[in-house]
């Protein structure tokens, strides 16, 4: 009896694991083995696929084959007993295109009201993702073990901290990876659970803000108790993307070590241009708080988000305001290459009733003014990026009198 070729061959690639599955064509024939050949693009000869020769089951693993994952390959399979079936050719494929991202490895650390999630690729030193290691982003689903209400968090990197949790509570989460450049979404990790600790005696500092004064940065925060000492640390923000490395080398800000006030001042030249994370910790000499929430700090935005400069053209019933780039010392304009929104506040000089206009444009009309009346105007700039939500201080108020009636043409 002629052996029939196997059918429905499926190629599953997860990370660097290459698995083949197929159906037997004839279940009634026993002791059949199966063998695969492969062919690379541009080659005429077929090569035996190691790991997939004389297989008795309907599954084999050819992960040991060192393939160029960006190169198209073709497979064929046949059944063997005393004689052999004809070859069944599988549609050619490119391993990288076919590959799925496997479940990432997840490690958890618990605090009283926070969990730190360390994520690394499931396959260490993967060949499949060798060129994409730094491009992985992750998303996670987290829930309280007791409630099951899920919260999704998208676009996180290899270290992520979730705040505002409840003490002594078990949280569960699962994580999956994505390579957005290749439109690939991975499979979820197994569920990991961890219990937050008892509430710490000292809470972490809150509401950390950075501002610029002269040539210095001023870092301020709030704290519940008096007579504390604080320390501040920084980290390059890009280091949170570092896959597989669980050591984050937070550095002290020298002028912010063991400070006894809820603020510290340090020179702008402490930081080169870049995006940093900052965190603050409190201590009373015996106990130490956990670290505060980490805030993102962009030196370019921080240093150069100066109040806008503007000119006013006065009409009888309106002001035309022309916003220009703020001036640095030396009267050179600051180039701000990120989108800004302008907040303009104006009021009648004899009144405290302020009105507000929010505008993206740099020429703004303030309407519905009374003729021959003194109005004052001040303005500030906001960044449009919600992750780097920064605002300049207000400009000094400029007061102008509107023109007499009928000059609005």
């Amino acid at each position: 009896k002629n052996l029939k070729s196997p059918q429905k061959v499926e190629v599953d690639i997860i990370d660097d694991n290459f698995i083949l599955r197929w159906n037997r064509s004839d279940e009634s024939v026993g002791n059949v083995t199966f063998s695969f050949d492969y062919q690379k693009t541009g080659m005429d000869n077929w090569i035996k696929l190691s790991g997939c020769q004389n297989i008795t089951s309907t599954k084999c693993n050819f992960s040991s084959l060192k393939l160029n994952v960006y190169e198209e390959i073709k497979l064929r399979i046949r059944a063997e007993k005393e004689n052999t079936s004809s070859w069944y050719e599988v549609d050619s494929f490119t391993p990288f295109r076919k590959a799925q991202i496997g479940p990432p490895e997840v490690h958890l650390e618990a605090e009283d009201k926070a969990i730190v999630i360390h994520i690394s690729p499931g396959t260490k030193d993967s060949v499949m993702w060798a060129l994409d290691g730094l491009s992985f982003t992750y998303s996670l689903v987290i829930w309280k073990n007791s409630s099951g209400v899920e919260e999704r968090i998208e676009n996180i990197y290899s270290r992520h901290k979730i705040y505002k949790l409840s003490p002594e509570t078990t949280y569960c989460l699962k994580v999956k990876a994505a390579l957005l450049t290749s439109w690939k979404i991975g499979v979820y990790s197994p569920v990991h659970c961890i219990k937050t600790t008892v509430e710490n005696e000292l809470p972490p500092p809150e509401n950390i803000e950075v501002s610029v004064q002269n040539q210095n940065y001023v870092l301020k925060w709030d704290y519940t108790y008096a007579n504390m000492t604080f320390q501040v640390q920084w980290l390059h923000a890009f280091l949170k993307r570092n896959p597989g490395n669980h050591l984050y080398k937070w550095k002290q800000i020298p002028d912010c070590e063991n400070v006894k006030t809820t603020q510290c001042v340090f020179p702008q030249n402490v930081f080169q241009k870049g995006i940093y994370l900052l965190r603050v910790q409190a201590s009373d000499g015996n106990n130490t708080s956990f670290w505060s929430e980490e805030i993102k700090f962009d030196t370019e935005i921080q240093a150069f988000l100066l109040p806008p400069v503007f000119n006013i053209r006065s009409l009888s019933d309106s002001f035309h305001i022309y916003i220009g780039a703020p001036k640095q010392s030396g009267n050179t304009p600051v180039i701000q290459d990120y989108p800004l929104i302008y907040e303009i506040i104006f009021w009648e000089n004899t009144s405290n009733a302020e009105r507000k206009i929010i505008e993206k444009k740099t020429d703004v009309t303030v309407p519905n003014l009374k003729p021959l009346t003194v109005y004052c105007v001040k303005a500030r700039a906001h960044t449009m990026d919600e992750k780097l939500n920064k605002s300049s201080v207000f400009s000094d108020a400029v007061c102008e009198k509107t023109k007499p009636g009928n000059t609005s043409k």
């Epitope: 490690h107 650390e109 618990a110 009283d112 360390h118 710490n200 005696e201 050591l247 984050y248």
Partner: antibody
Framework: EVQLQQSGAELVKPGASVKLSCTAS????????IHWVKQRTEQGLEWIGR????????KYAPKFQGKATITADTSSNTAYLQLSSLTSEDTAVYYC???????????WGQGTSVTVSS | DIVMTQSQKFMSTSVGDRVSVTCKAS??????VAWYQQKPGQSPKALIY???YRYSGVPDRFTGSGSGTDFTLTISNVQSEDLAEYFC?????????FGGGTKLEIK
């Protein structure tokens, strides 16, 4: 294979100084912290301090401030512990260990025995 | 400084038994606790990090648990080669500190 190879045993006189070395293989010390730990005979482990070999930043236990100086040479992938003004209290085995953050001190050297005696 | 207290200096157990070594921190250290095993005449060997994660190559009869201030290393199905001293360590705050150690004796 990750290894930390420490320098040989030292017999030194009171008041003198000694410099111990810890040479790493199988990894780059710049990617980790290197810690030093003291253990006196039949006693527990005492943390001395650590260095970030990338920039030389150090942290010390208050007890060892002024006694211990930790340095590193990234070109030879080696960390050092210098102990000064030695007394019999400094007689101990000193270990270096690699520290990987979350993963703590995952690899240890074999230890260097320091004996302070006149 | 954070004090790590291993109240039992010695523990006696038999092959095949289950034993728990405890460690108490003087303040909340989250889950930043590691356990090390030191056999006579050898350097310490890392067993557990981040309270409950085993290093690769460590037999699964070693498990870590706890959080905050109370931590436990459990050895189930104790083997003769587990005769050693066990140290806990916190690495949440500088200076990092070790427990005094618990010596495991095999009956």
């Amino acid at each position: 294979e990750v290894q930390l190879q420490q320098s040989g045993a030292e017999l030194v006189k009171p008041g003198a100084s000694v410099k111990l070395s810890c040479t790493a293989s199988g990894f780059n010390i710049k990617d980790y912290y290197i810690h030093w730990v003291k253990q006196r005979t039949e006693q527990g482990l005492e943390w001395i301090g650590r260095i970030d070999p990338e920039d030389g930043e150090t942290k010390y236990a208050p007890k060892f401030q002024g006694k211990a100086t930790i340095t590193a040479d990234t070109s030879s992938n080696t960390a050092y512990l210098q102990l000064s003004s030695l007394t019999s209290e400094d007689t101990a085995v000193y270990y270096c260990a690699r520290f990987g953050g979350l993963t703590a001190m995952d690899y240890w050297g074999q230890g260097t025995s320091v004996t302070v005696s006149s | 400084d954070i004090v790590m207290t291993q109240s039992q200096k010695f523990m006696s157990t038999s092959v095949g038994d289950r034993v728990s070594v405890t460690c108490k921190a003087s303040q909340n250290v989250g889950t930043n606790v590691a356990w090390y095993q030191q056999k006579p005449g050898q350097s310490p060997k890392a067993l557990i990090y981040a309270t409950s994660y085993r290093y690769s190559g460590v037999p699964d009869r070693f498990t870590g648990s706890g959080s905050g201030t109370d931590f436990t290393l459990t050895i189930s199905n104790v083997q003769s080669e587990d005769l050693a001293e066990y140290f806990c360590q916190q690495y949440n705050n500088y200076p990092y500190t070790f427990g005094g150690g618990t010596k495991l004796e095999i009956k």
